[in-house]
Amino acid sequence: CDLPQTHSLGSRRTLMLLAQMRRISLFSCLKDRHDFGFPQEEFGNQFQKAETIPVLHEMIQQIFNLFSTKDSSAAWDETLLDKFYTELYQQLNDLEACVIQGVGVTETPLMKEDSILAVRKYFQRITLYLKEKKYSPCAWEVVRAEIMRSFSLSTNLQESLRSKE
């Protein structure tokens, strides 16, 4: 399945929106920094695009869920958040179209399931961190930066997959 060219443009717009959403500097939050253990290897070891797409879909779905909460709405600029949702929604649609095209393979490889689980656990760690930090401005800033980092890494993987074909 070939993702439309607009998909990578959307990814760049998503990163731009995440950058614009910044309210305070990470420098003000040194003591709140945290290693969430982004499962980078789950993106690096997917050799075929067919295996990668469900993992990327899970990643974007989890980002959408994270920023769709009541606490998130209180933390960020509403206009930017709406634009952010729109971009994520479009990317989910693009990826879903690819997942549907690949439905011919009825058995989901175990490796793919493990990768999806690793992504879910990563977001559970983020959610727990926010809860423990009582959704403070610094906690949200640390999370925003972390999502930028992990989203950027997964986007780079997408690009490398496209260039290999």
Epitope: A19, R22, S25, S28, L30, A145, E146, R149
Partner: antibody
Framework: QVQLVQSGAEVKKPGASVEVSCKAS????????INWVRQAPGQGLEWMGW????????TYAQKFQGRVTMTRDTSTSTVYMELSSLRSEDTAVYYC?????????????WGQGTLVTVSS | DIQMTQSPSSLSASVGDRVTITCRAS??????LAWYQQKSGKAPKLLIY???SLQSGVPSRFSGSGSGTDFTLTISSLQPEDFATYYC?????????FGPGTKVDIK
């Protein structure tokens, strides 16, 4: 690609002040904190402080507190570092430096440096 | 302030040599450490961040390790362009501090 371009060399007398500018081009100015790092001739690197171009928030190293002021002009995408009550030990190359959006404390982008000479 | 020390302060090596530089912090800094390379008259260049992550575009012969107070920068096979001064920097707390540097020159 973001670039940091600094103002030219300065020669100042002891007791005077100097202002060094750092202009960001090719990127979103407000996205990255700008740090100032200096290096005396033949010496190591010394962090002076940082400024958030978006809010204007600053943190200065205790050593420079009261003598350094960092400001920004969002209309020209420029940050400024002013050091007052100059003494000979302030003779150094002054660099502005910036990190990425998610690890701004690691400086992957540097200006070319501005030599400030303090001499009577 | 957190003090950073480096050893050796200088070393002479040949092309192809394996070079190891150590950096020690006066208190635990977890993995909040970077390594920079600086050539004469130039601005420093980021090589390694978060103690062991290789900065984009930096050759894989450079590697970093360590956490807490003791860190190492290794150049697996020294190349002519690697002769320079190397600095470590802690990013754990303000003020950020650098090590005094290690100068690597030709034997």
């Amino acid at each position: 690609q973001v670039q940091l371009v600094q103002s030219g060399a300065e020669v100042k007398k002891p007791g005077a002040s100097v202002e060094v500018s750092c202009k960001a081009s090719g990127g979103t100015f407000s996205s990255y904190a700008i740090n100032w790092v200096r290096q005396a001739p033949g010496q190591g690197l010394e962090w002076m402080g940082w400024i958030d171009p978006k809010s204007g928030d600053t943190t200065y190293a205790q050593k420079f507190q009261g003598r350094v002021t960092m400001t920004r002009d969002t209309s020209t995408s420029t940050v400024y570092m002013e050091l007052s009550s100059l003494r000979s030990e302030d003779t150094a190359v002054y660099y502005c430096a910036s990190g990425g959006s998610y690890s701004p404390w690691y400086f992957d982008l540097w200006g070319q440096g501005t030599l400030v000479t303090v001499s009577s | 302030d957190i003090q950073m020390t480096q050893s050796p302060s200088s070393l002479s090596a040949s092309v192809g040599d394996r070079v190891t530089i150590t950096c020690r912090a006066s208190q635990s800094i977890s993995s909040w450490l970077a390594w920079y390379q600086q050539k004469s008259g130039k601005a420093p260049k980021l090589l390694i961040y978060a103690a062991s992550s290789l900065q984009s575009g930096v050759p894989s012969r450079f590697s970093g390790s360590g956490s807490g107070t003791d860190f190492t920068l290794t150049i697996s096979s020294l190349q002519p362009e690697d002769f320079a001064t190397y600095y470590c920097q802690q990013a754990y707390s303000f003020p950020f501090t650098f090590g005094p540097g290690t100068k690597v020159d030709i034997k």
